[in-house]
Amino acid sequence: EPHSLRYNLTVLSWDGSVQSGFLTEVHLDGQPFLRCDRQKCRAKPQGQWAEDVLGNKTWDRETRDLTGNGKDLRMTLAHIKDQKEGLHSLQEIRVCEIHEDNSTRSSQHFYYDGELFLSQNLETKEWTMPQSSRAQTLAMNVRNFLKEDAMKTKTHYHAMHADCLQELRRYLKSGVVLRRTVPPMVNVTRSEASEGNITVTCRASGFYPWNITLSWRQDGVSLSHDTQQWGDVLPDGNGTYQTWVATRICQGEEQRFTCYMEHSGNHSTHPVPSGKVLVLQSHWQ
C-alpha cells in the first residue's frame, strides 16, 4: 500500500450566492487526519494518533493552507455560471501518493453537486473530463477561470503536486504513520436465529492498517464464502478500523466453530461463547 495524503474541500452556494464557510477533510493513509468545519477554519487533528504525527507543534501552517485552499475554491465556484436556484456544492479532491519504490502520483478532481466533471494529473498536467455535455460545460467554465487567473494557476495549482508530497513526507517523518500497527480487539457474540440455529458474529475493532482477514472456520477448515456475511472495513473515528463477519450454525455445535483473524502477520482464533455467556473478548499482543 502506498502512503497517501488526500484533501477533500467542499464549498456551497445558495441561490447563486457562494457561502462563506467551507468544509475541509484531510486523510492520511486513508485515515481521517485533519478537519476544518467552521466559518473560521481551525485545523483539528482527528484523534490522538493525528496529534502524535506532529507532536507538540501547532497546526497554524495547516490552518493557513487549508483556509487559502478554501478561499480559492469559493472563488472557483463563484465563476461557475448557470447556477440554478437552491443549494449547490463544488468539491475538490486532491490526492498524492508515495509508493514503495519511491515513485509518486498526484491528482486533482472537481465535483459539482457530487458529480465528477474535471480531473488533472498533477505530474503530467494532463486534464481529463467525462463525456457528458454537462460535465464538459462545467469543465470548460472552471478551466477558463483557472487560465484567466494565470498567477494563481502558476503559484497555486501547479505547486499542488510538490506541496502535497512535501506535506506527506513531513508527516511520514514523524514515524508514527510508518511504524503504526494496532492489533484488533476481537469479540464473538451469539444470538438466536431460528429454532435449532444460532447466528454467530465475530467483530474486529480498533485495528490499523485496514487490511485484515476475518472468517469463520469449522474444525479448522474455512466455511465457504457464500455461507458468511461480511461487513465493510470502516474507520471507527479513532484512527483505526472495524469490521465483522457472521454465519449461521446449528445450536449445540458451537465448539466446532472458530473465528479466524489475521492482521499484520499475526493470527488468532476465537471460539464461540457457549451457554449464557454472550460476549467473549480477547486482545492478542
Partner: antibody
Framework: EVQLVETGGGLVQPGGSKLSCGAS????????MNWVRQAPGKGLEWISY????????YYADSVKGRFTISRDNAKNSLYLQMNSLRDEDTAVYYC???????????????WGQGTMVTVSS | DIQLTQSPSSLSASVGHRVTITCRAS??????LNWYQQKPGKAPKLLIY???SLQSGVPSRFSGSGSGTDFTLTISSLQPEDFATYYC????????FGGGTKVDIK
C-alpha cells in the same frame, strides 16, 4: 467402534460411477467429511470436502466439474459421484472424517479402509 | 493453491536413531498443518495436528514443530513399527497433502 466403510469400487467405465461411505459409532451429522485418493505407488491426494450441513463444499482442481460430493445425514452416508472418468483416476479411494478436537486444524482422525477404483477403457 | 514440499522424499535409518522430516509450504499457513503415517496397504493414521499437538494414542517419541512455512516431524528414537511413509497436510486454504517421505530400514 468408530468406523468408516467405503463401497462401490471395482472396474468402472469412463462414463461414471458412485462411491459410498457408511459411518457408524459416532454422530455422523456433526462431522465434516472428505474423500482422499491414492494412485498405485503414489502419494495421498485430497480430492473433496463437505461440512456437516453440506453448505461448504470444496474440490481439488483435478476433479472439479467431474466429481460431486454429497451426504445423507439420515442414512449416515457420504457419497462421491464420479463422471467423465480418466485413466489417471485409477486409485484407492478413502473417506476420512475431520476431527472435532478443540484447536483442530482440519486434521483427518478417522479413515476408511479404502476401495480400489480401476478405470477401464 | 498452496503447495507442500516434503524433504527428503525417502530416507534410510536405523532403529533407535533420531529422524527428522521437513515440510515446506508455498506460503504461510500459520499452524494449520497435520502429519500422518501410512503403512503399505493400510489407511493413513493421524499423528500430529495443529503443527505440534500430539493426537491421542500416538507415542510421545513423535513430535511436531514449526509455524508459517517451515514444519518438522521428529521421531526421537526410531522403532521397528515406525518404518512407513509420512505425509504432511494443510487446511489453511482448502486442503492439500505433501508428496510424502518414505522411511525404510538402513
Amino acid at each position: 467402534e468408530v468406523q468408516l466403510v467405503e463401497t462401490g469400487g471395482g472396474l468402472v467405465q469412463p462414463g461414471g460411477s458412485k462411491l459410498s461411505c457408511g459411518a457408524s459409532g459416532f454422530t455422523f451429522s456433526s462431522y465434516s467429511m472428505n474423500w482422499v485418493r491414492q494412485a498405485p505407488g503414489k502419494g495421498l491426494e485430497w480430492i473433496s470436502y463437505i461440512n456437516s450441513r453440506s453448505n461448504t463444499i470444496y474440490y481439488a482442481d483435478s476433479v472439479k466439474g467431474r466429481f460431486t460430493i454429497s451426504r445423507d445425514n439420515a442414512k449416515n452416508s457420504l457419497y462421491l459421484q464420479m463422471n467423465s472418468l480418466r485413466d489417471e483416476d485409477t486409485a484407492v479411494y478413502y473417506c476420512a472424517r475431520v476431527s472435532s478436537i478443540t484447536g483442530n486444524t482440519g486434521a483427518f482422525d478417522v479413515w476408511g479402509q479404502g476401495t480400489m477404483v480401476t478405470v477401464s477403457s | 493453491d498452496i503447495q507442500l514440499t516434503q524433504s527428503p522424499s525417502s530416507l534410510s535409518a536405523s532403529v533407535g536413531h533420531r529422524v527428522t522430516i521437513t515440510c515446506r509450504a508455498s506460503q504461510s499457513i500459520h499452524n494449520y498443518l497435520n502429519w500422518y503415517q501410512q503403512k503399505p496397504g493400510k489407511a493413513p493414521k493421524l499423528l500430529i495436528y495443529a503443527a505440534s499437538s500430539l493426537q491421542s494414542g500416538v507415542p510421545s517419541r513423535f513430535s511436531g514443530s514449526g509455524s508459517g512455512t517451515d514444519f518438522t516431524l521428529t521421531i526421537s528414537s526410531l522403532q521397528p513399527e515406525d518404518f512407513a511413509t509420512y505425509y504432511c497436510q494443510q487446511s489453511y486454504s482448502t486442503l492439500t497433502f505433501g508428496g510424502g517421505t518414505k522411511v525404510d530400514i538402513k
